[in-house]
């Protein structure tokens, strides 16, 4: 997996006019990072993880590059012919990477009630765009205003590209978020699914990186997937992962059934505990 | 039948490495974990830990970390255990098993290393 | 780590009597326990599985028992066959302990 740092601010317009303020997320490696909420912009650090990256250090850069960054989404929303009555978003998700190879990509997308409409290359300035005719008309009016702006030449796309770069190297500097390995927590649970069936759920959670396989196994052997739920792996806020797995049994078979993980070269199995049944909703 | 069929007795010198194998045969290779154990002569039984043949993913045994590295592989559906530094403590008989589920099901016939000058 | 506790050691009896092995642990290990019979220079087979689930092939007179941290293996009516060592593992949580074994000798 590259290390990435991705970007992700959000403006609205309501009948017409941009309304004040941005939403600003930024994610460090997948987690999220930093936050800024819709009226003031103070970039907060998105649990003790993110604090941990840069020690006792200030966000007074982060807060001015976002507050600016929020600054020219909204004038971009505001040059967008087609405004019509209600509520609007404009989105603009930036990203850059840097693989293990040492190499680097950088691309910029644009969304507008959540459909992207523009996205472009930040390192060959390559533009692409949807073929719908709407998306095409969008990209058209925002891309002409862009190149209008005084700022927005091709220094400035080289600079967004290198910025970001800059910051994701600073922040790998911590060695916070430099190839760690956190290997999960494991824990089985059972409920009532119907008469004379249970639902055994396992969960894994503290783990990074988000690579994992989670399964049941019955009598040694891998259950189809058909016979089994997943959810999906989602950022805990600590800077670690967590996902769970389902499958529903007889009552009576919990023996049989083992839930298997395996994460970062490592594996470990869970049985299902004794016990009384928890009468909990399930997930099917 | 399901077989595992291990490698024969070795006897070698104090402060080299051995690789133990574990064929296997009668069953589908990758869809079960294998497991190694060790018994010190007139002693009991250690679990020093499983490989799942299918991914090489491992699961040691602390004690045996850095002394045993485990490796399969699925093209000659045999599972290797690697013993490394060895001292007299090393000697012993190694199993390999199947796991099937929560329990041991198949066993090897025990490979008997000898570490000896 | 779990500890299993293996009783007695070792233990002497005529062919036709009834013995008990038990086995503790040092947590709930919820069942998850198996007995292996081992004869000198061959490896363990498998007795019972899930604390009282016998493996296919093994004679009715062997049964297992118990839960949460005390477990038990009766052979009722021994065979001459039947002597050797016995050990018990638990599967609850890696590390996978066995007991110290169990000695049954002909008297």
């Known amino acids: 997996e590259p290390h990435s740092l991705r970007y992700n601010l959000t403006v609205l317009s309501g009948d017409g006019s941009v309304q004040s303020g941005f939403l600003a997320e930024v994610h460090l490696d997948g987690q999220p990072f930093l936050r800024c909420d819709r009226q003031k912009c103070r970039a907060k650090p998105q649990g003790q993880w993110a604090e941990d990256v840069l020690g006792n250090k200030t966000w007074d850069r982060e807060t001015r590059d976002l507050t600016g960054n929020g600054k020219d989404l909204r004038m971009t929303l505001a040059h967008i012919k087609d405004q019509k009555e209600g509520l609007h978003s404009l989105q603009e998700i930036r990203v850059c990477e840097i693989h293990e190879d040492n190499s680097t990509r950088s691309s910029q997308h644009f969304y507008y009630d959540g459909e992207l409409f523009l996205s472009q290359n930040l390192e060959t300035e390559e533009w692409t765009m949807p073929q719908s005719s709407r998306a095409q008309t969008l990209a058209m009016n925002v891309r002409n205003f862009l190149k209008e702006d005084a700022m927005k030449t091709k220094t400035h796309y080289h600079a967004m590209h290198a910025d970001c770069l800059q910051e994701l190297r600073r922040y790998l500097k911590s060695g916070v978020v430099l190839r760690r390995t956190v290997p999960p927590m494991v824990n089985v649970t059972r409920s009532e699914a119907s008469e004379g069936n249970i639902t055994v759920t396992c969960r894994a959670s503290g783990f990074y990186p988000w690579n994992i396989t989670l399964s049941w196994r019955q009598d040694g052997v891998s259950l189809s997937h058909d016979t089994q739920q997943w959810g999906d792996v989602l950022p805990d806020g600590n800077g670690t992962y967590q996902t769970w797995v389902a499958t529903r049994i007889c009552q009576g078979e919990e023996q049989r059934f083992t839930c298997y993980m395996e994460h970062s070269g490592n594996h470990s199995t869970h049985p299902v505990p004794s016990g009384k049944v928890l009468v909990l909703q399930s997930h099917w | 039948q399901v077989q595992l069929q291990q490698s024969g007795a070795e006897l070698v010198r104090p402060g080299t490495s051995v690789k133990v194998s574990c064929k296997a045969s009668?069953?589908?290779?990758?869809?079960?974990?294998i497991e190694w154990v060790k018994q010190r002569p007139g002693q009991g039984l250690e679990w020093i830990g499983g490989?799942?043949?299918?991914?090489?993913?491992?699961n040691y045994n602390e004690k045996f970390k850095g002394k045993a590295i485990l490796t399969a592989d699925k093209s000659s559906s045999t599972a290797y255990m690697q013993l490394s530094s060895l001292t007299s403590d090393d000697s012993a008989v190694y199993f390999c098993?199947?796991?099937?589920?929560?329990?041991?099901?198949?066993w090897g016939q025990g490979t008997t290393l000898t570490v000896s000058s | 780590d779990i500890l299993l506790t293996q009783s007695p050691a070792s233990l002497s009896a005529s062919v036709g009597e009834t013995v008990t092995i038990t086995c503790r642990a040092s947590?709930?290990?919820?069942?998850?326990l198996a007995w292996y019979q081992q004869k000198q220079g061959k490896s363990p087979q498998l007795l019972v599985y899930?604390?009282?689930t016998l493996a296919d092939g093994v004679p009715s007179r062997f049964s297992g028992s118990g839960s949460g941290t005390q477990y038990s293996l009766k052979i009722n009516s021994l065979q001459p066959e039947d002597f050797g060592s016995y050990y018990c593992?638990?599967?609850?949580?890696?590390?996978?302990?066995f007991g110290g074994g169990t000695k049954l000798e002909i008297k």
């Open positions: 098993a199947r796991l099937d589920g929560n329990y041991v099901g198949y």
């Open positions: 593992q638990h599967f609850w949580s890696t590390p996978w302990t």
């Open positions: 947590g709930n290990i919820h069942n998850y």
């Open positions: 490989i799942n043949p299918g991914s090489g993913s491992t």
């Open positions: 899930h604390a009282k």
């Open positions: 009668g069953y589908a290779f990758t869809d079960y974990l």
